[in-house]
Structure formats: structure tokens, C-alpha cells
């Protein structure tokens, strides 16, 4: 029952003498396992015996007998699904039909496989895409209908006999569907590959040549052009003739149109391979190329730069940069269309030739105001000298120059005067637009560049002004030299360094902080009385009577200034002590009597001591000694002693008389 046996394998396998053949094969016997397998070469059915005749390459039977060929032929299958075979080595006479005779318990089957063994290794086959175009990546495929595990091979790509640099990807297939070895090469052909010979070479594992396939590449490309010019250097003078020729070195497919371009723009009515330019003008200078098109696209030649030579045209001057700032650098460029380029230049400043300046550029590293003006130039080449153009104006900008602060007042200036100053300058570019003054004050600026100081202060020493355009220039400060009466007059004690004691030598100094003018006179006064005209007031031996309020005056030509009143204090021991009695020196007993110790002292008496007629000190220490009630026994002479920080003083005796009251007398 044929439906029970299903086989899958390549229809035909290819190999060559000495190689091997690997036959991938699968089968399905539905009625049970395989019991017997015979591999025939060119089997023929014998009707008489009802068996197949032919060379038995391999036999697998129940009794296990196998022919000697089995070393070369191997059945790599199994009893139910795999029928893979290997013949190694394979020989030329193995060509033909292989018959796989399969038997199970109840069924038999003969499966036929074609084997094509050539005498020599057959060539691979190169497959090309239908069209190859320059710079477009293509894949070249080299296919060989052979692959066998026991016989490794390799496929190598050659271009004009040289191995190709691009990496090829080789793949093999040993399946029931197909057996092959394939190499794929990706590359981007250039126009120069057109007509070149590409070879796929079959080699054995050692790199030995076995066979090859060859193709000549047909690379479609835009026309490749060469441009030739007469004269060859493409340098001519106005009025000369020029011939340009366009040569097509390669075009695939054939070219269809020709055109010429100048500076990228197509020239009208120029559609031949030769471009004739008669009596050229300088306007015809430029970059020329020819363009030839085919079905792939346009091809362009390299550009030829046609130079039509002429004498320099009137020149113009370019200034980098105007206006220029004083001290900066400036470059002047002489621009003149000329061919060849000018070799010599003449420069003019305000119409006068600038000596030693013959270059296209003039560089002034440090610009000064006098560099301002008109600059012009003349260019010269081998064909002649150009004309001087209109020139260019250099504006040199600088801060105001020679700025001075000027006092407008008659001198000298006195404190309290109104002072007017002006800010003057010599030159400025651009014009002065504002002024600044130092130091700042609440001053009037009645007009630009004028400063009015009302009621000028004694301490307004210097004033400076700045004239400003884009920059400010400061004048040197000017001294106002304000004159004023002496200031800060005060009395200062020079000696003694401590307090003044009666009898000390004393010096007082009349001080002042400043005076303008410096020449001064001094006056000392006490209580409106002039004491002296020196800066110092001296006392050889001071007495308490010298104490009081002192003032000094300092005057100069502007005026006089008095000090604050200064109090001179003289310290002395208690003096002029006396005991006064109240209500009198005669008091009736029983009444009250008060004795007071009066004194003159500086500082005042701080401690009093009372003595009786026996010089006996009494237990009283205040200024007043109060006796109440007074007794007759209190009668007698009393004296007191006063003490301060300077010393002691004593009073003379004062007698107190206490007389009896009428009552006492009445009792007696």
C-alpha cells in the first residue's frame, strides 16, 4: 500500500569524484518499524524473481550481514523516520539512481534518489541583481549545489583576480528540501567596476582551487568626464580666445545630452563637446564645467577656473573699523578687482602719499587723533595701474584732551564767598555731552561745564572736573585756597599737669586748629581786661586771686575768633579762718550760742576741729558749734581748725562771755 510510505529528500544530489555525498532523508512507515534496508545502485525490477537486481551498496538484514562497501556507504537512519545516507568518498560511477529498498513486517517500498557525480568539481553559479548602479549597494550571490559534512569547502570572491575586501557571508543547507553552499557579498560598486571581472572561486578546506564562475560587471553610471582647456593654465587676457573640450571617459548607458555650465549656471546654445570663447572679457572669468547626461543621470566634469586678466579697476578702501578708538589698531584694505592680483599698492592719507606702504593692507597698531582723515589707494598689476577711488574716511574717537578746572573768581577766595568754576578742554571726538565734578556737593550748574558754589566752606580744598563724551577725562584737582578766620580756638593748660595749687607756676596755651592765612595774633583777657598778646599766658606763682574766667582770641587778616571762657581754679589750704558767734560774743546763760568757723578754702573745708582756751579739742567736727543751753562755764576763748585736701588753717581765739541770768543772780 503505497500510501503507507512517505519519503522526503532532495530529488537530485550533486557531487564530484573524491568528494562525498550526504543525503538528508526522512520516511514514515505506518504499519510498523523497518526490518530490512538495502541501498541499490541503479536498481532494476526482475519480474521473474519479483525482486530488484543491481549493485548493493549497503544492506542491513536481520542476520546483520553487511558487504565490504558499507565502510564507504553509511545508513545514518533509524527504524521509523530517518533514512539519511552518506557516501564518502563518492566516485564517478556512483552517478545514477540510488534505490532505497525498505521492508517492514507486512510492506515493502523502493524509493529512488538521483545522484549526479561529475569528473571534476563543477563550478558554482554567480547570481547578479538585474541591474547594478554605481554607489547603490548590491548583493552578489554565489551558489553551489553541494554540501557534505565530510568534505568542507569554501567560496571566495575575487575582483580582477584579487580577493575582495568586503566580508562575504557563507551559508550551507543540508535539509530534505535542499542541499547547497551559498556565499553572499554586499558591496557598493563604483563606475570603475564597470567591465571588471568578478570571480567566485570554489576551494577545498586547504584553499586549493577546485572550480570557479566568472562574470563581468555591468555597472550603470553617469557619464565620467574630463575637461581640457587651451591654453592649459586657463589664464588669458581680455580679447584672447579660449577653447574647452569635454571628453567622456566612460558612460553606461550611452550619453544623450551635453551642456556647459559657468559658475553653476547653464550656458545657452552650448550643446557640443567643444566650447569656444572668442575675444573673452573679464566677465567671462569663472568656473566652467561640462555636464553630460545619460539615463542614470547627469555627470559633471571637474571645474576649470578661467581667469581673464585685466588691469586693476578703480580701488576702494575698506576700514576695519571706523570710527576707531584712539590707541586701538586699525587695518585698511585696498580693494581693487584685478587679474592677476595687484602686486603693488600706493596709499594716500588726505591726498598725500604714505611712504613705505606698498601692501594690500595697511596696519596701524596704535591709532592717534592725527591719523583721522581720508585714505585712498592705487593698485597695480602686470597689466597696468588702476585709478584712485574716492577713498574712505577714518574717524578717530578719543576722550576729551587737556581738561582743566578754572576758577573764575578774583583771588583770594574767602569763606562764605560764591565761587564759580568752569571745566575747559582742548579737543574732543565725539563732542563733550556732560561734565562731572569731584567731590560731589549740592552745587548749582547754571550752564554746561560751569559750577557755582554758594557760601563756600573753609574746608573746600580742591575741586576737579571731568569732561565726558563716550569717555570721561578728569582734570587735575584745583586748590580753592579758601581763606578763613582761625578755627577751633580754645584755652589749654600746659602746666601743671595736675590741679593748680596756690603758688604753682602755671602756663595756659591759646590753641587753634587752622587758619588761612597762617599769620595770626593772640589776645588774652580776664573779665574784659587784656592780659597779654602771646600764645601763652604764664603765672610764676599763682594765687587764689588769679582764679577766674579767662578767654583767648586769635585773629588773622580775615577775622578773629574767641575761645570759650575757660575757668582757672586755684587750690589752697583753708585761710582767713575766724570764729563768729551768734547771737553775739556775750550771751546769757540758758540761751543758745552758735559758734561758726568761717574760712576761705579751695576746695572747701572738709573737716573742722574745735578747741577751747586750754587748746583742748572739743568733740565737735562740723562748721557750727552749737551750745544750748549755754552755761557760764562755757565762757572762754575758742578757736577752730579747718582742713581740706590741700592743708589746714587755724583761726585766732575768739572769746565767748556767758553771763548769769537775772534768775541766777536773784537766787544768789
Amino acid at each position: 500500500d503505497s500510501s503507507k510510505w512517505v519519503f522526503e529528500h532532495p530529488e537530485t544530489l550533486y557531487a564530484w569524484e573524491g568528494a562525498c555525498v550526504w543525503i538528508p532523508c526522512t520516511y514514515r512507515a505506518l504499519d510498523g518499524d523497518l526490518e530490512s534496508f538495502i541501498l541499490f545502485h541503479n536498481p532494476e525490477y526482475n519480474k521473474n524473481t519479483s525482486k530488484f537486481d543491481g549493485t548493493r551498496l549497503y544492506e542491513s538484514t536481520k542476520d546483520g550481514k553487511v558487504p565490504s562497501e558499507q565502510k564507504r556507504v553509511q545508513f545514518l537512519g533509524d527504524k521509523n523516520k530517518n533514512c539519511t545516507l552518506s557516501i564518502h568518498p563518492v566516485h564517478l560511477n556512483d552517478s545514477g539512481q540510488l534505490g532505497l529498498r525498505m521492508e517492514s513486517k507486512t510492506e515493502k517500498w523502493m524509493e529512488r534518489i538521483h545522484l549526479n557525480v561529475s569528473e571534476r568539481p563543477f563550478p558554482p553559479h554567480i547570481q547578479l541583481p538585474p541591474e547594478i548602479q554605481e554607489s547603490q549597494e548590491v548583493t552578489l550571490t554565489c551558489l553551489l549545489n553541494f554540501s557534505c559534512y565530510g568534505y568542507p569547502i569554501q567560496l571566495q570572491w575575487l575582483l580582477e583576480g584579487v580577493p575582495m575586501r568586503q566580508a562575504a557571508v557563507t551559508s550551507t543547507s543540508l535539509t530534505i528540501k535542499s542541499v547547497f553552499t551559498r556565499s553572499e557579498l554586499k558591496f557598493s560598486p563604483q563606475w570603475s567596476h564597470h567591465g571588471k571581472i568578478v570571480t567566485c572561486q570554489l576551494q577545498d578546506a586547504d584553499g586549493k582551487f577546485l572550480s570557479n564562475d566568472t562574470v563581468q560587471l555591468n555597472v550603470k553610471h553617469t557619464p565620467k568626464l574630463e575637461i581640457k582647456v587651451t591654453p592649459s593654465d586657463a589664464i588669458v587676457r581680455e580679447g584672447d580666445s579660449v577653447t574647452m573640450t569635454c571628453e567622456v571617459s566612460s558612460s553606461n548607458p550611452e550619453y544623450t545630452t551635453v551642456s556647459w555650465l559657468k559658475d553653476g549656471t547653464s550656458l545657452k546654445k552650448q550643446n557640443t563637446f567643444t566650447l569656444n570663447l572668442r575675444e573673452v572679457t573679464k566677465d567671462q572669468s569663472g568656473k566652467y564645467c561640462c555636464q553630460v547626461s545619460n539615463d542614470v543621470g547627469p555627470g559633471r566634469s571637474e571645474e576649470v577656473f578661467l581667469q581673464v586678466q585685466y588691469a586693476p579697476e578703480p580701488s576702494t578702501v575698506q576700514i576695519l573699523h571706523s570710527p576707531a578708538v584712539e590707541g586701538s589698531q586699525v587695518e585698511f584694505l585696498c580693494m581693487s578687482l584685478a587679474n592677476p592680483l595687484p602686486t603693488n599698492y600706493t596709499w594716500y592719507h588726505n591726498g598725500k602719499e604714505m611712504q613705505g606702504r606698498t601692501e594690500e593692507k595697511v596696519h596701524i597698531p596704535k591709532i592717534l587723533p592725527w591719523h583721522a582723515g581720508t585714505y585712498s589707494c592705487v593698485a597695480e598689476n602686470i597689466l597696468g595701474t588702476g585709478q584712485r577711488g574716492p577713498g574712505a574716511e577714518l574717524d578717530v574717537q578719543y576722550p576729551p584732551k587737556k581738561v582743566t578746572t578754572v576758577i573764575q573768581n578774583p583771588m583770594p577766595i574767602r569763606e562764605g564767598d560764591t565761587v564759580t568754576l568752569s571745566c575747559n578742554y582742548n579737543s574732543s571726538n565725539p563732542s563733550v555731552t556732560r561734565y562731572e565734578w569731584k567731590p560731589h556737593g549740592a552745587w548749582e550748574e547754571p550752564s554746561l561745564g560751569v559750577l557755582k558754589i554758594q557760601n563756600v566752606g573753609w574746608d573746600n580744598t580742591t575741586i576737579a572736573c571731568a569732561a565726558c563724551n563716550s569717555w570721561c577725562s578728569w582734570a587735575s584737582p584745583v586748590a580753592l585756597n579758601v581763606q578763613y578766620a582761625p578755627r577751633d580756638v580754645r584755652v589749654r593748660k600746659i602746666k601743671p599737669l595736675s590741679e593748680i595749687h596756690s603758688g604753682n607756676s602755671v602756663s595756659l596755651q591759646c590753641d587753634f586748629s587752622s587758619s588761612h592765612p597762617k599769620e595770626v595774633q593772640f589776645f588774652w583777657e580776664k573779665n574784659g581786661r587784656l592780659l597779654g598778646k602771646e600764645s601763652q599766658l604764664n603765672f610764676d606763682s599763682i594765687s587764689p586771686e588769679d582764679a577766674g574766667s579767662y578767654s583767648c582770641w586769635v585773629n588773622n587778616s580775615i577775622g578773629q575768633t574767641a575761645s570759650k571762657a575757660w575757668t582757672l581754679e586755684v587750690l589752697y589750704a583753708p585761710r582767713r579762718l575766724r570764729v563768729s558767734m551768734s547771737p553775739g560774743d556775750q550771751v546769757m546763760e540758758g540761751k543758745s550760742a552758735t559758734l561758726t568757723c568761717e574760712s576761705d578754702a579751695n576746695p572747701p573745708v572738709s573737716h573742722y576741729t574745735w578747741f577751747d582756751w586750754n587748746n583742748q579739742s572739743l568733740p565737735y567736727h562740723s562748721q557750727k558749734l552749737r551750745l544750748e543751753p549755754v552755761k557760764v562755764q562755757h565762757s572762754g576763748a575758742y578757736w577752730c581748725q579747718g582742713t581740706n585736701s590741700v592743708g589746714k588753717g587755724r583761726s585766732p581765739l575768739s572769746t565767748l562771755t556767758v553771763y548769769y541770768s537775772p534768775e541766777t543772780i536773784g537766787r544768789r
Epitope: 563550478p123 580582477e160 571588471k196 562574470v215 563581468q216
Partner: antibody, heavy 116, light 112 residues
Framework: QVQLVQSGAEVKKPGASVKVSCKAS????????LHWVRQAPGQRLEWIGY????????EYNQNFKDRVTITADTSASTAYMELSSLRSEDTAVYYC?????????WGQGTTLTVSS | DIVLTQSPDSLAVSAGERVTMNCKSS????????????LAWYQQKPGQPPKLLIY???TRESGVPDRFSGSGSGTDFTLTISSVQAEDVAIYYC????????FGGGTKLEIK
């Protein structure tokens, strides 16, 4: 070995056409381009064009492109060059040739005489 | 097309003499992929097809006597016969095959 064998000499009248054959052997015919070159008496060799037998692609010298047709029969490994509107200046020896990487193979030449 | 200009047109030398002939190309025939110059030299005798002497500008074809040598690169090429023999009388052509094919006008060699 590689051989290119050309058809015999031809005598033609002006205005007529001629078809010269070139049979290739000893190599795979479709692997290489086949060129045609002619040489007029006492003149330089002049390239006419080529055919790529693999895909019948042709390329011609601009001087001939309106009058020449190159064809190939791969089954017979033979290339043909047909020249029409013959004139006396077409009198020349016509060669087929092919290049290999390191050599050139030439046919023996076919003499064409154009005479009234 | 690439134009090949040969010089001189003809020359006559005595047997045994050294001879050089030139071929100038209007464009370079150097192929960058393999750094070979695609220029060949042929010898052609009357009634015969051209015979290849030199390919790749300087490689001698097998069987060609070593008195023949080629040199040059890019656009300027020379064929030298170191010692001219009587059988060398022929016309010598240069041939570029980088792009299409073009041939030089030939140099005719004669023996005095």
C-alpha cells in the same frame, strides 16, 4: 583551451548589411563580455562595442551606434555583429575578442570588403 | 573616450639596439581597487590578429621573450625592446581597457 572562431570573408556592396559570427569555446560563454574591434587597411584598431551574453546588454562606440547591432546566442555560444548601410570606408578586418583577468583572446579576423 | 597617443609613429633601428616607444593617455588608466594600470601592448604583423605582449602595463604575457618590457603608471607608458631582433618588425599598439576599449595609433618598427 579558449578559442574564438569567426565566419569567413565577406564582399558587400555599399548600402548592404553584413553579419559576422564569432563562435566561442573552451569557457563559459555567459561569463565574459564579447567585444568587436575592426582595423581598416593601414589604420589603427577601432573598438566597435561589446555584448554581455549573460543578459544581452550591449554598449557601442558612438561612431557606430546607429548602424551596428551585436547579438548573442547562448545556446550556440556564438556572438554576432551586424553592420548596416555599408560604405567603402567599412572595408576592414573585423575581430571579436574577449578579456580575461590576465590575458586577451582574439578571433582570427573576418575580412569585409565593401565595393560597388 | 580615453584617447591614447603613441609616439613616434615609426622608427628604424639596427638589430641588437635598444628601442623605446611611448603611449600617453588622456586620462589615468589606474584602477584604484587593485592598483593596476589597465593598459596592454600588442604586436601585430601583417595579416595577423594582434598578439598580446604586456598587460597591466608591466606584466609580460607567458611565452613573450623577456627582451620586451613595459613600464609607466597613470597616463604615461613605455614599451621597451632591450635588443631588437629581425622578427620584431611589426606595428606595436597600446590598448586601454579600464573604460570601454581604445587603442593607440601604433608605432611601426623597422630594421635598418
Amino acid at each position: 583551451q579558449v578559442q574564438l572562431v569567426q565566419s569567413g570573408a565577406e564582399v558587400k556592396k555599399p548600402g548592404a548589411s553584413v553579419k559576422v559570427s564569432c563562435k566561442a569555446s573552451g569557457y563559459t560563454f555567459t561569463s565574459y563580455w564579447l567585444h568587436w574591434v575592426r582595423q581598416a587597411p593601414g589604420q589603427r584598431l577601432e573598438w566597435i562595442g561589446y555584448i554581455n551574453p549573460r543578459n544581452d546588454y550591449t554598449e557601442y562606440n558612438q561612431n557606430f551606434k546607429d548602424r551596428v547591432t551585436i547579438t548573442a546566442d547562448t545556446s550556440a555560444s556564438t556572438a554576432y555583429m551586424e553592420l548596416s548601410s555599408l560604405r567603402s570606408e567599412d572595408t576592414a578586418v573585423y575581430y571579436c575578442a574577449r578579456r580575461d583577468i590576465t590575458t586577451f583572446y582574439w578571433g582570427q579576423g573576418t575580412t569585409l570588403t565593401v565595393s560597388s | 573616450d580615453i584617447v591614447l597617443t603613441q609616439s613616434p609613429d615609426s622608427l628604424a633601428v639596427s638589430a641588437g639596439e635598444r628601442v623605446t616607444m611611448n603611449c600617453k593617455s588622456s586620462q589615468s588608466v589606474l584602477y584604484s581597487a587593485n592598483h593596476k594600470n589597465y593598459l596592454a601592448w600588442y604586436q601585430q604583423k601583417p595579416g595577423q590578429p594582434p598578439k598580446l605582449l604586456i598587460y597591466w602595463a608591466s606584466t609580460r604575457e607567458s611565452g613573450v621573450p623577456d627582451r620586451f618590457s613595459g613600464s609607466g603608471s597613470g597616463t604615461d607608458f613605455t614599451l621597451t625592446i632591450s635588443s631588437v631582433q629581425a622578427e620584431d618588425v611589426a606595428i606595436y599598439y597600446c590598448h586601454q581597457y579600464l573604460s570601454s576599449w581604445t587603442f593607440g595609433g601604433g608605432t611601426k618598427l623597422e630594421i635598418k
